[in-house]
Amino acid sequence: TLNSVLNSNAIKNLPPPLGGAAGHPGSAVSAAPGILYPGGNKYQTIDNYQPYPCAEDEECGTDEYCASPTRGGDAGVQICLACRKRRKRCMRHAMCCPGNYCKNGICVSSDQNHFRGEIEETITESFGNDHSTLDGYSRRTTLSSKMYHTKGQEGSVCLRSSDCASGLCCARHFWSKICKPVLKEGQVCTKHRRKGSHGLEIFQRCYCGEGLSCRIQKDHHQASNSSRLHTCQRH
């Protein structure tokens, strides 16, 4: 269940060094106690890795993707799953580990020499690619720095939000993805239920802008579940 995933008793590491006036806060040397965390949390070791609940790939780490842990994909909570290595099966780019992308259902190396043309093919051929991500260092880092000299303007084809100019995000439009405006206060937004329903949207909306979150509009609380209207509202 969601609670059991969240409330796992993972072994925690100590926090990093604090370095007072004489210390070096910029360094990452031996650990020392001293940071107050909500609920007394410390750090989780990778050895005691616990799956994290998610609604979309961007909520997971760079070496993970968001999906249902069961094969059918319809059983309750989605969690962050370890990315797939080269030559493993995939359905979208985010499933592949950094330095790879999903082509014809297989994770392949993102060879920079052949990248540009293949990406453009892949955008149009992959309707299921919800959160396409592709660059060579980490699939989450900016593609534009390696391939595109300018950030995509509204309507430009993109793979992920970092390909788009400030104030835009990369969202699906028909069978490709384009840069669309980030939503402003009062604009209608999509609140994804945790079963990955966002994978079915042909016209995907951007997320709400800075300082806003997608919540049920006050006067729609009484409406039935299916007709509830969500808008971007101040925190």
Partner: nanobody, 125 residues
Framework: EVQLVESGGGLVQAGGSLRLSCTAS????????VGWFRQAPGKEREFVTG????????YYADSVKGRFTISRDNAKDTAYLEMNSLKPEDTAVYYC??????????????????WGQGTQVTVSS
């Protein structure tokens, strides 16, 4: 290794606002988690807020919820902390920190490997 530099601190009256910036260099900022911590004189450093690599997840300590907003611009290798309705008890040195975001976890639970030198925020009553 990622180097972090904070800016935007200063003296402000209670009820006022400040915007802190944390600019990174020397690493893949857009694949890191970013946290803001603060340390008041004679107190332990505390976790204030955090944001994951994509900006899709944020976390706020109860003491700043509704007043502080964290955001990031990966294209500029910069994270921001917008602080509104400041109180005297917000007075502290504010540190920006980051760490690898390979595996998701609660934002306070990350291993923050790289730290800035801090920027002083003073709220007068």
């Amino acid at each position: 290794e990622v180097q972090l530099v904070e800016s935007g601190g200063g003296l402000v009256q209670a009820g006022g606002s400040l915007r802190l910036s944390c600019t990174a260099s020397g690493g893949a900022f857009s694949s890191t988690v970013v946290g803001w911590f603060r340390q008041a004189p004679g107190k332990e450093r505390e976790f204030v807020t955090g944001i994951n690599w994509s900006g899709a997840r944020t976390y706020y300590a109860d003491s700043v919820k509704g007043r502080f907003t964290i955001s990031r611009d990966n294209a500029k290798d910069t994270a921001y902390l917008e602080m509104n309705s400041l109180k005297p008890e917000d007075t502290a040195v504010y540190y920006c920190a980051s760490g690898r975001d390979r595996y998701a976890r609660a934002l306070p639970d990350y291993e923050y490997l790289w730290w800035g030198q801090g920027t002083q925020v003073t709220v007068s009553s």
